[in-house]
């Protein structure tokens, strides 16, 4: 293509000048004789015309073929379709034109989407055809195949386009370039009609591809980074298909000095450094093929950043607790740098920061450290503390942000039963929240064991993390390498920058959590009375075991007892409890022997079942009630018991045998089933009565007696008896005994209301004992019937009855109240009995 | 304290191209623009242009289209390239440092002599 | 670009006379951005007043500044020996930053 002008990504001056007569003049192309024919067979030369004293007689009738002004050649070639046998008619001022020729600046490029090729006729300034309309063509071709093709394509396989020159004095021309086509020659000329004259330019030859113009970088942003510098940055334009180099410039307008600056990047961000504050920055960045010829874009749209009066850096600092970290400050003021000497620091206005924490950086940049942080104290919605850079005695109202968290966060890891899956644990309540914050668990698996000193490797894997209801997160490794140490720590992400809890190394195999002993029982062994309980372990972890037994009562609040069994092969346990009769809530859990590990979960719960383990101790109280004539002969007597406690029937009854022996009859026996009343004739001078408790094993041994005899009815030791109200709850007792020959066993008290037809109430009470408490619920305004019956080995003695209260010395009693309780003979037999009785009495 | 110490050959022909550098010892490199000046002989002082620690440059049109100002920041220093010099380029060259936030020179060089002669 | 001239070319006084040097551009220069250098036969200029009047760092007090707009002048008050040099003016408040062409003061 030796005959083609190749374009440059320049701007370049299409010359027309007048013909010249004589040929010596004109500057042939390389490899052009004077004699060669061009492609129109017409011994015609493209030059370019120096002279101008040529005479234009017959321009109307001429097209003029034009050069490319260049300052090193002259070249010019032929374009190939000539325009034959057309007449134009020139209006052309030839004078004008014979002194300067006709100029044309032209451009071309691709445009940044690839699609259109594009070449701008513009119309110079002192283009003696600049008055007259332009028409403008350009014919193009792209040929298919270069290598096979005739060193200039042949006439009429040129495609033509029409030019826009819409705007006055420049025309815009559009080829469209198939996108595989962009690495090919684009064949072109120009053909210019103005004034009647046709200009036409030399043959030109074009690889669109290393004409491309870039559209403008896009989203121009600054910022100033945390180290004090002005970040540049944007975006390259879509759809260019190779790397570009950037030109960035920028002017720095502040009150103290102006400049303007420029640089030459491949990177799409870049920084300034030494930014000054109170100063506006204006920046624009272009665009051009780093590797190869191209065309710079178009500036972008200029975008300004203004600096503060007071700029830090970094703004904001979030650390840790225990850290130290430094905050740097340019200061003006009053269109002054302030020197770095006179900058003093301040801590929320409050607290000047000591001068031995300041480091003077430079001429005009001031540091403060600030060691060992504390964790930052929330002041009303302010999370950070405010650090302050001052010329001397005044303070901008700017600051610099201090956020200091303490960033202990405790993971705890646990490896289920079954060696599948670990589960670990974390919460944020320890650590202050900061809004904006994210947090991530991060870890590090490491192919064996866990090293020493855990920290945190920079290739780390997120994992995640679900919040529990308890304000846990929870994160679940599945599947797990038991023997693999893990890494872990907590991330907590902020704009600001990211924290990292202290690392924590799990070793899987450390941390399993056993699944709970199975097949739990327990029982309460028969005629021994031990709590006998027994397990069998889980199958993992094949570790020895130990053991923890938990027991107690059942019931809504379980006191637990604890017992520890450290024997791995053991597999029950009996232990000894107080209450052989109760239901006992018994659970295991198993954890490793070595330490490692985590106590299983309490297994399930194993109830004993309440049976008798021996006969019971001992029969019920009674009591009779003897109705009818008191003169009669044969009287009905009704006995009453109090149902056997747990204790002393362990651990049930099932009925009550009454054991009837009268010298006369015998003995016999009658069953009276669960009841606890029963009522028999008593027709004989005396009748013994016994009831015995019977359970599941036998009969009560230790049972007590009663013996109804008429003579013993009579008996009476009771001197006197006396009632003394103490309150409304409690009536002290008190009597005087005569001596007996008979064997005294004990006393029943009765007491009934008399205005009521209520039951009679009964205790039984020690013989040795000459007052008693009564506990009940007396009604001040009733009247009581207090009875006092001595009993004998021999039978029931006379009772001893009162039908109200004592009047003279009631008074004495209630002052004497605190004495009484106090005296010995209320010691600690009556005591124990008074308890027990009251005990029973809530029970009639 | 700020000490600018410049080095480079005194003599040069027509057309050869002038290398001047420049090391800056003591004080901060970082954040400053690194300027050169020069004044012919007998004459005034002329700004030659400057140059940031980060690479971006600012000449005087009248030179721009010879001189390079180039930085090397691991070194701390800065250099000084004017191609195609003529006798008109003959002066002592200066290297300063501009004063942070103004367009002044605080801290000179010791001046060099280039001439340029056949 | 903007032109600095100064006037006079030279100045003959005396140690402990006041001195007065004038700087006037071609176009406005904001005070912000004119300064003033004192430099000695075979020396480095030196910085002696930034901003039009403030004073540069080891500066004695006895030069001052001022002036603003197009026209800018150096008093020194008292001249001492040490003083009689050349004094330049420059302006950077538009691009390129330009010096004026000197004025000598010289011991009478």
């Known amino acids: 293509f030796n005959l083609s002008y190749p374009i440059t990504p320049w701007r370049f001056k299409l010359s027309c000048m007048p013909p010249n007569s004589t040929y010596d003049y004109f500057l042939l192309p390389a490899g052009l004789s004077k004699n060669t024919s061009n492609l129109n067979g017409h011994y015609e030369t493209a030059v370019e015309f120096n002279s101008s004293d040529t005479h234009f007689s017959n321009l109307s009738k001429t097209t003029f073929h034009c050069c490319f002004r260049s300052e090193q050649d002259r070249n010019c070639s032929l374009c190939a379709d000539n325009i034959e046998g057309k007449t134009f008619v020139s209006t052309v001022n030839s004078s004008v034109f014979q002194q300067m020729g006709a100029n044309w600046n032209i451009q071309c490029w691709l445009k940044g989407d690839l699609k259109l090729f594009i070449c701008y006729v513009e119309s110079l300034f002192k283009n003696p055809f600049k008055n007259y309309k332009h028409k403008v063509h350009l014919l193009y071709v792209l040929p298919e195949v270069l290598e096979d093709s005739p060193l200039v394509p042949q006439k009429g396989s040129f495609q033509m386009v029409h030019c826009n020159c819409s705007v006055h004095e420049r025309c815009e021309c559009l080829v469209p370039v198939p996108t595989a086509k962009l690495n090919d020659t684009l064949l072109m000329c120009l053909k210019i009609t103005s004034g009647g004259v046709i200009f036409q330019s030399p043959l030109m030859s074009v690889q669109p591809i290393n004409m491309v113009k870039p559209d403008p970088p896009l989203g121009l942003r600054m910022e100033i980074t945390d180290d004090g510098n002005l970040k540049i940055s944007w975006s390259s334009p879509p759809l260019v298909p190779f790397p570009l180099q950037y030109e960035v410039k920028y002017s720095e307008n502040s009150t103290t000095v102006i400049r303007e600056a420029d640089k030459i990047v491949s990177a799409t961000s870049l920084l300034v450094d030494g930014i000054l504050p109170g100063s506006s920055y204006e920046v624009q960045v272009r665009g051009k093929r780093l590797d190869g010829p191209g065309i710079w874009s178009d500036w972008s749209t200029p975008h300004v950043f203004t600096t503060q009066d007071v700029i830090y850096f970094p703004p904001k600092i979030l650390t840790s607790v225990g850290s130290n970290v430094s905050f740097h400050c340019i200061y003006k003021n009053e269109n002054k740098i302030v020197s770095s000497k006179k900058i003093v620091w301040w801590m929320n206005l409050a607290e000047k920061i000591p001068q031995s924490q300041y480091d003077v950086v430079s001429d005009h940049v001031s540091k403060v450290t600030f060691f060992n942080l504390n964790e930052t104290k929330p002041r009303g919605k302010f999370t950070y503390d405010a650090v302050y850079c001052c010329n001397e005695h005044e303070c901008h109202h700017r600051y610099a942000e201090l956020y200091v968290i303490d960033v202990n966060i405790n993971i705890s890891c646990e490896t289920d039963g079954h060696l599948t899956k670990m589960t670990c644990r974390w919460s944020t309540n320890t650590i202050q929240s900061l809004a904006g914050s994210t947090l991530q668990l991060r870890y590090r698996r490491s192919s064996l064991y866990c090293f020493d000193i855990p920290s945190i490797h920079p290739i780390s894997k997120p994992k995640d993390c679900y919040l529990q209801s308890d304000g846990f997160y929870e994160c679940v490794f599945q599947p797990i390498f038991l023997l693999s140490g893990y890494t872990m720590w907590i991330r907590i992400n902020h704009p600001l920058g990211s924290l990292d809890s202290p690392p924590t190394c799990v070793l899987p195999d450390s941390v399993v959590k056993p699944l709970p002993p199975s097949s739990v029982k327990a029982e309460i062994i028969k005629n021994i009375g031990l709590l006998k309980i027994s397990w069998e372990k889980p199958v993992f972890p094949e570790n020895n075991l130990q053991f923890q037994i938990r027991y107690g009562l059942s019931g809504k609040e379980i006191q637990w007892k604890m017992y520890d069994v450290y024997d791995a092969k053991s597999k029950s346990v009996s232990l000894p409890v107080p209450d052989f009769c109760a239901v006992y809530a018994v659970q295991v859990r198993c954890k490793r022997s070595d330490g490692l590990g985590l106590w299983s979960n309490w297994s399930n719960p194993a109830y004993t079942v309440v049976m008798d383990i021996k006969v019971p101790m001992r029969g019920p109280e009674f009591w009779r009630i003897i109705n009818g004539d008191t003169m009669k002969k044969e009287k009905n007597v009704t006995l009453l018991w109090k149902p056997l406690m747990k204790n002393d029937s362990l651990c049930s009854v099932q009925r009550y045998v009454i054991n009837h022996h009268t010298s006369c009859n015998g003995t016999w026996s009658e069953d009276v089933g669960n009841h606890t009343k029963f009522t028999f004739l008593w027709t004989e001078q005396a009748h013994t009565v016994t009831v015995l408790a019977i359970n599941s094993i036998g009969a009560s041994v230790a049972n007590f007696n009663l013996t109804f005899s008429w003579p013993m009815s009579k008996v009476n030791i009771v001197q006197s008896l006396s009632a003394y109200p103490l309150n409304s709850s409690c009536v002290i007792l008190s009597w005087i005994l005569s001596p007996s020959d008979y064997k005294l066993m004990y006393f029943i008290i009765e007491w009934k209301n008399l205005n009521e037809d209520g039951e009679i109430k009964w205790l039984r009470i020690s013989s040795s004992v000459k007052k008693y408490y009564i506990h009940d619920h007396f009604i001040p305004i009733e009247k009581y019937q207090f009875s006092l019956y001595p009993i004998f080995m021999e039978g029931v003695g006379k009772p001893k009855i009162i039908n109200s209260f004592a009047q003279d010395n009631t008074e004495k009693h209630q002052n004497d109240e605190q004495k009484l309780i106090s005296e010995e003979d209320l010691g600690g037999e009556q005591k124990l009995i008074s308890e027990e009785d009251l005990h029973h009495h809530h029970h009639h | 304290q700020v000490q600018l110490q410049q080095w480079g050959a005194g003599l040069f022909k027509p057309s050869e191209t002038l290398s001047l550098t420049c090391d800056v010892y003591g004080g901060s490199f970082r954040g400053y623009y690194w300027s050169w000046i020069r004044q012919p002989p007998g004459k005034g002082l002329e700004w030659i242009g400057e140059i940031s620690y980060s690479g971006f440059t600012n000449y005087n049109p009248s030179l721009k289209s010879r001189v390079i100002i180039s930085i090397d920041t691991s070194k701390n220093q800065f250099s000084l390239k004017m191609s195609s010099v003529t006798a008109a380029d003959t002066a002592v060259y200066y290297c300063?440092?501009?004063?942070?936030?103004?367009?002044?020179?605080?801290?000179w060089g010791q001046g060099t002599l280039v001439t340029v002669s056949s | 670009e903007i032109v600095l001239t100064q006037s006079p070319g030279t100045l003959s006084l005396s140690p402990g006379e006041r001195a007065t040097l004038s700087c006037r551009a071609s176009q406005s220069v904001s005070s912000s951005y004119l300064a003033w250098y004192q430099q000695k036969p075979g020396q480095a200029p030196r910085l002696l007043i930034y901003g039009a009047s403030s004073r540069a760092t080891g500066i004695p007090d006895r030069f001052s500044g001022s002036g603003s707009g197009t026209d800018f002048t150096l008093t020194i008050s008292r001249l001492e020996p040490e003083d009689f040099a050349v004094y330049y003016c420059?302006?950077?408040?538009?691009?390129?930053?330009?010096f004026g062409q000197g004025t000598k003061v010289e011991i009478k």
């Open positions: 420059q302006q950077y408040g538009s691009s390129p930053w330009t």
């Open positions: 300063a440092r501009v004063t942070y936030g103004y367009g002044t020179f605080d801290y």
